[in-house]
Each structure stands twice: as structure tokens, then as C-alpha cells.
């Protein structure tokens, strides 16, 4: 009866350069328990080589010379006594491409090369990229361990060298970036930057790399309020904004953070559980009223913390003037001027373009001022008769603008013409 030698191994296997592959294999050979028990030796050879002379690519026979180019990279895995001939190939090289055959030997009775079941190995260019592993999300200020590994690679062959590059790594010393692992303490400015792990096998031309974009979670560090695209100045978490009464106001609150913070506006200085007047970063007031003078708060709420800024809104108005109006009274010529402005304006009277300051020492004129509600009133009393035609002006001004009015007093006329002349500062 013919001796039975059988081998189960896949016909072909493909592996990328620099990576590893395990080729499962099992075999059978004729063996009788009453035979003597010489050791069982198995071998993997390059196809086309004669077992008696060739160096093996892998064997369990300590007396057989192994090809230097496969030493340590081609290994028998599993128990040959259990007829396991599985072959592990590590750090695959292009020159490993080819066919291999398996051989079994046990004493003088069992010697056989399984030439009918050859293994075809094809080594292709490396396209596999390393994986960069870390616990997400990355949190600003919290040290995180990152590791770089190549799927399908193993310990066989020369060691792998690593290099890490990226803006987030600038403070690290070069030695740290040559390990497969590194500890990174990300900063907010590292969010969205690239981190690259490059792997190279020592002495080989095989290089592969993976780049990841860092997703750094960070609480808002600053809040900026924009009006018409221009950032307002902020001092000690407070911003001051003067607004013209009646004007429309649109403010945008921005607090860079990741993930984006929830922005909301509140009236005044709110308690933590206050109800916002806007649930977005935009505050819109169609017509600013003086009643809205005071404050608004923009709050940026984030899982990692919150930040808020107080906006001190001061409502201003240009001076509005009524008058002057003049009439003859017992004391003399009595002129009145009414005005309204925020902040409260200053006022002066002019006679023939000459300012009338305070009260005259000679008693030729007298100025009185009073206020009621948003309006302020000033009166001018001129003693004595008019020697000629006279022009009386009153002018009100604040830091935002001025307005003046004048009246021309004609000698011998009882009806006095008036006109209001607004004047900008």
C-alpha cells in the first residue's frame, strides 16, 4: 500500500512589504507506533532548491543551516508533533516573493518533500497605514497617551523606528517623538492641527505614515463681542458700548471652544438659572431706548466650563433743542431754551455771537437753568432796551454732538422771529 503523505496549505498568500502573515498548515505522513522514535524534523524550502544542499527558510532541526535572509523572519508556529506546519512570515520583503515547499523527515523511513502543494508567496508594495490610537476626545490641558501601530506588523525583523510630527509636539524633546507612544498635553490652539506618525523599518526602504487632525476639546478661553464686524474692547470681563438712542443694534458674541459653546444673552447680570433673552450668540435691539441702558451678559456654556462677559450699554442721544423763544417782560427781554440729550449737555447763550457766561456783574443779563424729566430748561433775561437789531443764540452740546438755535430781535418789532439751527460738533 502506498504511503500517505498529505499537506493542507493555501496555494497562495499575499502580504504587504514590511508586514507579517501567518500561513496555516497541517500535514500527515505514514508512521507506525512500533517504529523507533527518531525526532521529527520539518522544513520549509524555497522552490527549486534541493533539500539536501539548500539552506532552509524555516525548520525545527537545530543542525540545519537557515538562510541568513530569512533568519528570524520565517518561523514555524505550532506543534510539529501535532502535525502543524504553520509558517509565520514577518517583515516581508519583496525578494521573499516566490514559491515554497514543505518537507518532513523522521529517521530513514520518513523523508518526503510535498512538491504537489507549494505555497506561493507574493509580497506587494506597502499601502497599509499605521493606526494612531488615543482616548477621545482629547481635552485641553489633560495629558493623553497616544500610540502608533501598524496593523499586520509584528516583532519579526529589524526594529521599527517611529517619528511623530505636528505643531502640538513642539515642546517635546526629540527622543520622545521617536517612540511608538507619546504623551501629549493638548492646548486649545492644537485643535484642528495635524499630527503625523511615520514608521520605518531600520535598514529598509519601507516607510508608511498616518496623519490625523486633532480634535481637542476645550472650554472657551475668551469671549469677544462684535458690532458690525468690529470687536469691542473688553476690560476685566466688561465691555462698554455707547449706542445712539433709537438706533438698531446687532451684537455678535463669539467664544471659540470645541465643541462649540452654547451662547446666550441675558438682561443685566444674571443668576446661573436665569432665562436668556437670546438663545444664540446674537443680540438684536430694533430701536434702542434709554430704558435699555444698563447691561447685558453674554454667557458661553461648555461641558468643560463656562465664561461670561458683561456689556455695559450706555444709551446716548444728540442734543435736541426747542427755542430759543423770546418775549418782552417787565424785567426786560426774557429768552427761553429747552433741550434734551444723553448724557446731559452743556449749554451756552450767545449775544451777537458773544458768549454770555454766568451772570453779568453789571446786571445787564441773568441766566437761569432748571430740569424736568428728560428736558432741561435755561432762561436768559436781558435788562434794558434794545439799541439795535439783536441776534440771540442758545447752543447745547455733549460729547456726541451739538445743536444751536437763534432768534433775531428786530428793533421796534413786537413779533420776534425764531429759527433753530442744528450744528454738529
Amino acid at each position: 500500500e502506498k504511503p500517505v503523505y498529505e499537506l493542507q496549505v493555501q496555494k497562495s498568500v499575499t502580504v504587504q512589504e514590511g508586514l507579517c502573515v501567518l500561513v496555516p498548515c497541517s500535514f500527515s505522513y505514514p508512521w507506525r507506533s512500533w517504529y523507533s522514535s527518531p525526532p521529527l524534523y520539518v522544513y520549509w524550502f524555497r522552490d527549486g532548491e534541493i533539500p539536501y544542499y539548500a539552506e532552509v527558510v524555516a525548520t525545527n532541526n537545530p543542525d540545519r543551516r537557515v538562510k541568513p535572509e530569512t533568519q528570524g523572519r520565517f518561523r514555524l508556529l505550532g506543534d510539529v508533533q501535532k502535525k502543524n506546519c504553520s509558517l509565520s512570515i514577518g517583515d516581508a520583503r519583496m525578494e521573499d516573493t516566490g514559491s515554497y515547499f514543505f518537507r518532513v523527515e523522521r529517521g530513514r523511513d520518513v523523508k518526503y518533500s510535498y512538491q504537489q502543494n507549494k505555497l506561493n508567496l507574493e509580497v506587494t508594495a506597502l499601502i497599509e497605514k499605521p493606526d494612531i490610537h488615543f482616548l477621545e476626545p482629547l481635552e485641553s490641558g489633560r495629558p493623553t497617551r497616544l500610540s502608533c501601530s501598524l496593523p499586520g506588523s509584528c516583532e519579526a525583523g529589524p526594529p521599527l523606528t517611529f517619528s511623530w510630527t505636528g505643531n502640538a509636539l513642539s515642546p517635546l524633546d526629540p527622543e520622545t517623538t521617536r517612540s511608538s507612544e507619546l504623551t501629549l498635553t493638548p492646548r486649545p490652539e492644537d485643535h484642528g492641527t495635524n499630527l503625523t506618525c511615520q514608521m520605518k523599518r531600520q535598514g529598509a526602504q519601507v516607510t508608511t505614515e498616518r496623519t490625523v487632525q486633532l480634535n481637542v476639546s476645550y472650554a472657551p478661553q475668551t469671549i469677544t463681542i462684535f458690532r458690525n464686524g468690529i470687536a469691542l474692547e473688553i476690560l476685566q470681563n466688561t465691555s462698554y458700548l455707547p449706542v445712539l438712542e433709537g438706533q438698531a443694534l446687532r451684537l455678535l458674541c463669539d467664544a471659540p471652544s470645541n465643541p462649540p459653546a452654547h451662547l446666550s444673552w441675558f438682561q443685566g447680570s444674571p443668576a446661573l438659572n436665569a432665562t436668556p433673552i437670546s438663545n444664540t450668540g446674537i443680540l438684536e435691539l430694533r430701536r434702542v431706548r434709554s430704558a435699555e441702558e444698563g447691561g447685558f451678559t453674554c454667557r458661553a456654556q461648555h461641558p468643560l466650563g463656562f465664561l461670561q462677559i458683561f456689556l455695559n450699554l450706555s444709551v446716548y442721544s444728540l442734543p435736541q433743542l426747542l427755542g430759543p423763544s423770546c418775549s418782552w417782560e417787565a424785567e426786560g427781554l426774557h429768552c427761553r431754551c429747552s433741550f434734551r440729550a444723553r448724557p446731559a449737555p452743556s449749554l451756552c447763550w450767545r449775544l451777537e455771537e458773544k458768549p454770555l457766561e454766568g451772570n453779568s456783574s453789571q446786571g445787564s443779563f441773568k441766566v437761569n437753568s432748571s430740569s424736568a424729566g428728560p428736558w432741561a430748561n435755561s432762561s436768559l433775561i436781558l435788562h434794558g432796551g434794545l439799541s439795535s437789531d439783536l441776534k440771540v443764540s442758545c447752543k447745547a452740546w455733549n460729547i456726541y454732538g451739538s445743536q444751536s438755535g437763534s432768534v433775531l430781535l428786530l428793533q421796534g418789532r413786537s413779533n420776534l422771529g425764531t429759527g433753530v439751527v442744528p450744528a454738529a460738533l
Epitope: 522552490d47 532548491e49 534541493i50 539536501y52
Partner: antibody, heavy 119, light 112 residues
Framework: QVQLQQSGGGLVKPGTSVKLSCKAS????????IHWVKQRSGQGLEWIGW????????KYNEKFKDKATLTADKSSSTVYMELSRLTSEDSAVYFC????????????WGQGTSVTVSS | DVLMTQTPLSLPVSLGDQASISCRSS???????????LEWYLQKPGQSPKLLIY???NRFSGVPDRFSGSGSGTDFTLKISRVEAEDLGVYYC?????????FGGGTKLEIK
């Protein structure tokens, strides 16, 4: 028991060819390298070449490359050597020898077959 | 080709004597796999050669222990400690490390 049984040869005319055979038994045919060795009358031994059925590997001594052609028939476990364009120089006893194992030695020999080239 | 030179060409001995045959190769016969394939064969008249020693010093199965081989590099020796009548014949050294494989010219061991 390993045995190599040789046949063929005899008296042949110059310019013709002869095919010698070496039939193996007692082992797995693909596991032995079969060598052919020439010995002229009263002379030493000369290695002609080998045939390894395991991978159909053939190696020749350059001196015999144009003289000898080695082939095999696995089904009959036989290795052949054909000698062409025979001359009197080819008159000799030809041995086949089996070589198995890592010891590199020709451990089993056929009985030899004689070729006489004469008109 | 590797030239194998045997000395002496003829070695007359008395039965029971020690015999020594030398073989020198024209270059190292260490194979690329690390083995030295130096063998000794004995051919008796009208017979096929028989293997005695392989890989310089290993006796083939069934070969009496009075036969021993030694040497390295390019110089090798076959010794027969006590010659017996059945040992007579022509001894050939052989190298199987480099193609073409080559035999020595032979040493004829004969009775004095």
C-alpha cells in the same frame, strides 16, 4: 530495501545514440537524486550529472553537457540517460547512483551497464 | 573544476597493517551551506563502488569501525587501522560540494 536496476547499453555504432535506464525501487522516487558516473576500462570515475525528480532539477558536468541528456518517468520510477553522437571515447561502464539525505553521498549504486561503441 | 589529487597511486600493505590514503583538493570544498561533502568510496574488481565515509569523517551504515576519515579545508585522509583481505580494491575520494563533482584518481590497495 533501496535498489537501482540498470539496463540498456551493449554494442552500438559510432554516431548513433543509446538510452540507458535506471529503475528505482524501495523508496519514494522523488526523494532521491540519481547520479550518473562514467568509468572507462581500467580508469577512474567521472561524474556526468544528476537528475532530481523531486523538483525536476538537472545538473550536468559541462564536459558532458552536449553528450548526455537526463530524463525521468515518474510513473515507472525510472531515470534515463541518453548518450548521443557516440564515439569510441564513450565506450565505458556507466553507473547510476542514488543519493538521499543531507550527507551528500551516493549511498546506493546500480550494477553498471556497459556501452561499447564500435562499427 | 576542483581537482582531487590522491596519494599514493598504489598502496601495498600486509594484512593487519594500518593503511593511510591522502586526498588533496585544489580549493576549499566547504559547501555554501557549511557542510564539507568529502566522501570515500571503495570499488572492488567487477563491482560498483561502495560508500565508506561521508562528510569527511562519518562512517556509512554497515562500514566497519576500522575505517576512519579526517581532515579539513583541502587536506583529507582515509585510515584503515587493520587491513583485512576484503578491504582490497581501489579507493576513491570524492567532493560533492562544487559542480562538477569530482573524484580523485584512485588509490589501489593491494597485498605486498
Amino acid at each position: 530495501q533501496v535498489q537501482l536496476q540498470q539496463s540498456g547499453g551493449g554494442l552500438v555504432k559510432p554516431g548513433t545514440s543509446v538510452k540507458l535506464s535506471c529503475k528505482a525501487s524501495g523508496y519514494i522516487f522523488t526523494e532521491y537524486i540519481i547520479h550518473w558516473v562514467k568509468q572507462r576500462s581500467g580508469q577512474g570515475l567521472e561524474w556526468i550529472g544528476w537528475f532530481y525528480p523531486g523538483i525536476i532539477s538537472i545538473k550536468y558536468n559541462e564536459k558532458f553537457k552536449d553528450k548526455a541528456t537526463l530524463t525521468a518517468d515518474k510513473s515507472s520510477s525510472t531515470v534515463y540517460m541518453e548518450l548521443s553522437r557516440l564515439t569510441s571515447e564513450d565506450s565505458a561502464v556507466y553507473f547510476c547512483a542514488g543519493h538521499e539525505g543531507y550527507d551528500g553521498a551516493m549511498d546506493y549504486w546500480g550494477q553498471g551497464t556497459s556501452v561499447t561503441v564500435s562499427s | 573544476d576542483v581537482l582531487m589529487t590522491q596519494t599514493p597511486l598504489s598502496l601495498p600493505v600486509s594484512l593487519g597493517d594500518q593503511a593511510s590514503i591522502s586526498c588533496r583538493s585544489s580549493q576549499s570544498i566547504v559547501h555554501s551551506n557549511g557542510n564539507t561533502y568529502l566522501e570515500w568510496y571503495l570499488q572492488k574488481p567487477g563491482q560498483s563502488p561502495k560508500l565508506l565515509i561521508y562528510k569527511v569523517s562519518n562512517r556509512f551504515s554497515g562500514v566497519p569501525d576500522r575505517f576512519s576519515g579526517s581532515g579539513s579545508g583541502t587536506d583529507f585522509t582515509l585510515k584503515i587501522s587493520r587491513v583485512e583481505a576484503e578491504d582490497l580494491g581501489v579507493y576513491y575520494c570524492f567532493q560533492g560540494s562544487h559542480v562538477p563533482w569530482t573524484f580523485g584518481g584512485g588509490t589501489k590497495l593491494e597485498i605486498k
